[in-house]
């Protein structure tokens, strides 16, 4: 007997989708071997329709896929737009179709129920609105119009033109009789319930001359859309509930084991603490649609999610909903990166951000998650070189190490920098990730002077002290601009106006500018790195003034403990523009900083990953 298991019989109707889950023993061989879905022909051969190696037959093109979940020993075959031709005998299996492990599945696709002749079918999701059209002849124009619901052999009056309304439909039904000449009346039912499902009868007049029309109302529990996302990645739920509820509070909730639905986020300001720092509810469009983005997906995020509208901001019977079943794939393409990065006040952090390596040319962004109201994420920096004004001189996004990872460096840290930040690109939205910056007790490892004033035409020497533990690291000085941090040439690159020399014995790396020019004014960073992986940085601002006294200026090491001017993120930042979540800017405040000097020449950034979950900043 085969150890592969699945549904022996699957039945559906034309136009629907099926999602067939097959189970296999999750041995290491089974986990990585080929998975397939094939159709058994008259000859007994089984023709592959879709496989885990990417093959999709022409018959299934654009409507089927196979997703493997190796960590729990399952794979799922999704087939959409079913037709009666899809009825037949299939196998789901592992390895080679003709031998190996498989399970027989019978798929039956039917036409749907038989209905009385001339029956109009209305298929509507629960919570939505239906308009039933009821034609009549001229002689019945002045007579009573009514809608009945057929329950077994009896007909129950639902509404009529004499103002009767069945209590089950109170406050959500109306009968409209148009002006003269239009031989049709309509019945509008709002906020449909599952119990409204069934056969209805429109009637105009009475006796043998009455007009009748059958209507079959199919109220559907919204079929959950199956969503498969990678661990650590991101999911977006797009929720379109219709204009009828455009001005009603919206929510996303998750169905729990008690079959109630716990609010994850709503437009009334409620948010589940489990999603702190990693969820945004996108502003509504005019049509009332909205979307919710969740990043940093965890295995425990799996489950059934519903979005809906109700004035209470939570699930209520008879209001429109949309449903998803979220599966989180543990065999993720998204690499592990620290979810928490620690730094000390005055110090720095270097954050590694993953992106889809197939999209190396995509624009990279970093934004600060703000939890107020529905959450927003104003952009702080992007790879094109725009940096928020408040972060001038202390924030840089660098393309290194590349190949699926970029780096963001933030220095001159204050307690107000603690919080959640998102890494994102203008490409694959599933690669959005979240990192939390924590400010802990401690002293920065790199020490530079607080302020430096250089004199035009003279020599400036700025010291940067580093501890012994960085002796094996590469030390560098760079000049910050809003496009990066241009590394300054080291002494062995030959004579230069600006060069770096390092005295290992005194654990000092000094920046020398000779002679000082107006263009030298600006922010300079001292930093350490290992290859393309950047460690800590310290920043110093150099102001340039006219010559007053002859001689060169040397900033003595004694001044190195002076604190740099702190730049604090103003909480009352003027909001320029709110953009929809589909825009990678995530409602960024687009304040553009003028270029402050040298263009970055490929200098980039990195992280010291002390563990897979936390990466150290200046707190080593």
């Amino acid at each position: 007997k085969s150890p592969v298991f699945g549904p022996q019989e699957v039945s559906s109707v034309e136009g629907n989708s099926v999602s067939i889950k097959c189970y296999y023993p999750p041995t290491s061989v089974n986990r990585h071997t080929r998975k397939y879905w094939c159709r058994k022909g008259a000859s007994g051969r089984c023709i592959t329709l879709v496989s885990s190696e990417g093959y999709v037959s022409s018959n299934y093109a654009g409507r089927a896929n196979l997703t493997n979940f190796p960590e729990n020993g399952t794979f799922v075959v999704n087939i959409a737009q079913l037709s009666r031709d899809d009825s037949g005998h299939y196998k789901c299996g592992l390895g080679i179709n003709s031998r190996g492990l498989s399970f027989d599945v019978s798929l039956e696709v039917s036409q749907g129920p038989e209905l009385p002749n001339g029956t109009e079918v209305y298929t509507v999701d629960v919570g939505r609105t239906v308009t039933i059209k009821c034609p009549f002849k001229t002689e019945n124009a002045p007579k009573t119009k009514a809608l009945y619901k057929k329950i077994g052999q009896t007909s129950v009056l639902v509404i009529d033109s004499r103002n009767y309304v069945n209590p089950n439909y109170k406050d959500r039904i109306r009968l409209r009789i148009p002006g003269t000449g239009q031989l049709i009346f309509t019945v509008v039912i709002d906020r449909l319930r599952l119990s409204d499902h069934g056969l209805y009868l429109c009637q105009a007049g009475d006796g043998s001359n009455r007009d009748e029309k059958n209507a079959d109302l199919q109220v559907l529990e919204p079929e959950p859309e199956l969503v498969y996302e990678d661990l650590r990645g991101s999911v977006t739920f797009h929720c379109a509930l219709g204009l009828e509820v455009a001005n009603v509070a919206k929510f996303l909730c998750r169905v729990n084991s008690r079959e109630t639905c716990d609010v994850v986020i709503n437009t009334l300001g409620k948010r589940d603490s489990a999603f702190e720092g990693r969820i945004l509810l996108n502003p509504q469009d005019k049509d009332g649609s909205f979307s919710v983005v969740i990043t940093g997906l965890r295995k425990e995020d799996e489950g059934r999610y519903l979005c809906g509208a109700h004035s209470d901001g939570q699930l209520q019977e008879g209001w429109p909903i949309q449903a998803w079943q979220l599966f989180v794939n543990e065999e993720s393409t998204i690499p592990r990166s620290p979810t928490v990065v620690k730094g000390v006040a005055g110090g720095s952090v270097a954050v590694l951000c993953p992106y889809n390596p197939k999209e190396s040319q995509s624009l990279k962004y970093w934004c600060l998650w703000e939890g107020a109201q529905n959450g927003r994420c104003p952009l702080l920096v992007e790879s094109q070189g725009l940096v928020q004004e408040q972060y001038e001189g202390r924030l840089s996004l660098l393309q290194e190490p590349g190949n699926g990872t970029f780096t963001v460096i933030l220095n001159q840290l204050t307690t107000q920098d603690a919080g959640f930040y998102w890494c994102l690109t203008n490409g694959d939205t599933r690669w959005r990730t979240t990192v939390e910056i924590k400010i802990i007790e401690g002293e920065p490892n790199l020490k530079v002077p607080g302020n430096v004033t250089a004199v035009l035409g003279e020599t400036l020497n700025i010291p940067c002290h580093f501890p012994c533990k960085f002796s094996s690291y590469e030390k560098y000085w760079c000049k910050w601009s809003n496009t990066g941090c241009q590394t300054l040439p080291s002494q062995d690159e030959g004579p230069s106006e600006a060069f770096v020399n390092c005295d290992e014995n005194s654990r000092l790396v000094s920046l020398t500018l000779n002679p000082v020019t107006r263009a030298d004014e600006g922010w300079y960073w001292c930093g350490v790195k290992q290859g393309h992986f950047y460690g800590e940085t310290a920043a110093v601002y150099v102001a340039v003034e006219e010559k007053k006294v002859a001689g060169s200026r040397y900033v003595s090491p004694a001044k190195a403990d002076a604190a740099p001017d702190e730049k604090v993120l103003d909480s009352g930042v003027r909001e320029i523009e709110n953009k929809a979540i589909q825009d990678p800017r995530l409602f960024a405040e687009e304040k553009v900083v003028a270029d402050t000097g040298d263009q970055a020449g490929g200098s980039r950034a990195s992280v010291d990953s002390s563990s897979s979950e936390e990466q150290g900043g200046s707190s080593k």
């Epitope: 019989e9 039945s11 989708s17 999602s19 189970y23 559907l220 959950p224 729990n256 079959e259």
Partner: nanobody, 126 residues
Framework: QVQLVESGGGLVQAGDSLRLSCAAS????????MGWFRQAPGKEREFVTT??????????YYADSVKGRFTISRDNAKNTVYLQMNSLKPDDTAVYYC?????????????????WGQGTQVTVSS
Amino acid sequence: QVQLVESGGGLVQAGDSLRLSCAASGRTRTTYGMGWFRQAPGKEREFVTTITWSGSTNYKYYADSVKGRFTISRDNAKNTVYLQMNSLKPDDTAVYYCAASTVLTDPRVPTEYDYWGQGTQVTVSS
């Protein structure tokens, strides 16, 4: 909460048929699957069959030991699941439990089910 009530059990001869019913009441709206397990004296509870659904699509799972003999079906309007048992054998003697789940990862695993009925005795004599 969801309440499940089984009925239809009894004493039959080998080769006979029996039909079990399981009526669900309460908050059945988000119920995703219902099935049958059985437990013979001194043995562990074992999977028999389950039906899961999504809209108008149904998925039926059967244990190898009952394939071709037992059939599961459901009446959506009545919130009821039926188990038609044909060609019964003495080995089928057990207490049959109805179970319901809101999210089902593996229909064969009893712990995946959130709600259980009290059980109905089926005895097949030779």
